[in-house]
Interface confidence: medium
């Protein structure tokens, strides 16, 4: 099979997922495409534990995650349910909740310097984090 049993070189394994942390900046869509080309997606944060792990690795730097509201409602790029899921917004954020073109047009979410989330203009060149899940039940042993 083509199951992934260990993380690629330069990726960090944590709780059955692999993470890659950029050191350069891209617009959200470019970061999104970059992760796709790695068979991954922008990071989807589902718990406090994962939040703390990512925060530890990115430091106090604005960093894109896989959360956007480019069509109205907030959506995680991997389909994880937003409404019932983990959230860590800064106070008063997100401040463009309702609109395309009616407010500030801030449609993409990022980690801020303190780790809490903010929505911002999608074309700002922030760092980003890719995530890909290790297969839960691999049919093959890892190659030695």
């Amino acid at each position: 099979g083509s199951e992934r049993t260990c993380c690629p070189v330069n990726w960090v394994e944590h709780e059955r997922s692999c993470y890659w942390f950029s050191r350069s900046g891209k617009a959200w869509a470019d970061a999104d495409n970059y992760c796709r080309l790695e068979d991954a997606h922008l990071v989807v944060v589902t718990s406090w534990e994962e939040q703390k792990f990512v925060q530890h690795h990115i430091g106090p730097v604005n960093t894109w995650m896989g959360l956007h509201d480019q069509n109205g409602p907030w959506k995680w790029v991997d389909g994880t349910d937003y409404e019932t899921g983990f959230k860590n917004w800064r106070p008063e954020q997100p401040d463009d909740w309702y609109g395309h073109g009616l407010g500030g047009g801030e449609d993409c979410a990022h980690f801020t310097d303190d780790g809490r989330w903010n929505d911002d203009v999608c074309q700002r060149p922030y760092r980003w984090v890719c995530e890909t899940e290790l297969d839960k039940a691999s049919q093959e042993p890892p190659l030695l």
Partner: antibody
């Protein structure tokens, strides 16, 4: 409501120049990337150029690179396309469009016709 | 440069389902957007990021994307759906459109 209105089209001779404008209203213009797209008579859509929300980045189609320049005035909520060394194959309806964040063209203007003919 | 291939025409019977394909090398790794253009009108974004519908677009319009093919599906086709449909991706600093597909509703 959200609106984009193009102007500046017309008939021009080959080798001459023309500047198109796109007036935006109903949204915070300075927060969005903007595109130009054209459509020759009876043909499909052809992307022309994009400019970042703050003017810091521009990309062009190979067919217009070195001849066309995209620019914007955020204080006037206006997008421009300066077209130099025009050719007959540049004849088309030119649309401006607002970026959505994933390089989708979320809002389109009504278009302005440019005819390059001697 | 990246190329997108669409059929020139796809027909649909009134009330039936139409599927318009957009082929490209590993297109499943890209974000695909779809536009509808009626005669004499500007294009309208109908599907964004493979399968998201902008507000105001009927649920009859849906999209999928994997492998080398993205697909726009129009369920319960109506006379008002007659239009040209274009797919679009972003690749290496340029936006790329497919050649367009004409949809007559019979």
């Amino acid at each position: 409501q959200v609106q984009l209105v193009e102007s500046g089209g017309g008939v021009v001779q080959p080798g001459r120049s023309l500047r198109l404008s796109c007036a935006a209203s109903g949204f915070t213009f300075s927060n969005y990337g903007m595109h130009w797209v054209r459509q020759a008579p009876g043909k499909g859509l052809e992307w022309v150029a994009i400019i970042w929300f703050d003017g810091s980045n521009e990309y062009y189609a190979d067919s217009v690179k070195g001849r066309f320049t995209i620019s914007r005035d955020n204080s006037m909520s206006t997008l421009y396309l300066q077209m130099n060394s025009l050719r007959a194959e540049d004849t088309a309806v030119y649309y401006c469009a607002r970026e959505s964040g994933s390089y989708a063209l979320y809002i389109w203007g009504q278009g302005t016709m440019v005819t390059v003919s001697s | 440069s990246y190329e997108l291939t669409q059929p020139l025409s796809v027909s649909a019977a009134l009330g039936q389902t139409a599927r318009i394909t957009c082929g490209g090398n590993n297109i499943g790794r890209k974000n695909v957007h779809w536009y509808q253009q009626k005669p004499g009108q500007s294009p309208v974004l109908i599907i964004h990021r493979d399968s998201d519908r902008p507000s105001g677009i009927p649920e009859r319009f849906s999209g999928s994307n994997s492998g080398n093919t993205a697909t726009l599906t129009i369920s319960r086709a109506q006379a008002g759906d007659e239009a040209d449909y274009y797919c679009q991706v972003w690749d290496s600093g340029t936006a790329v459109f497919g050649g367009g597909t004409k949809l007559p509703v019979l």
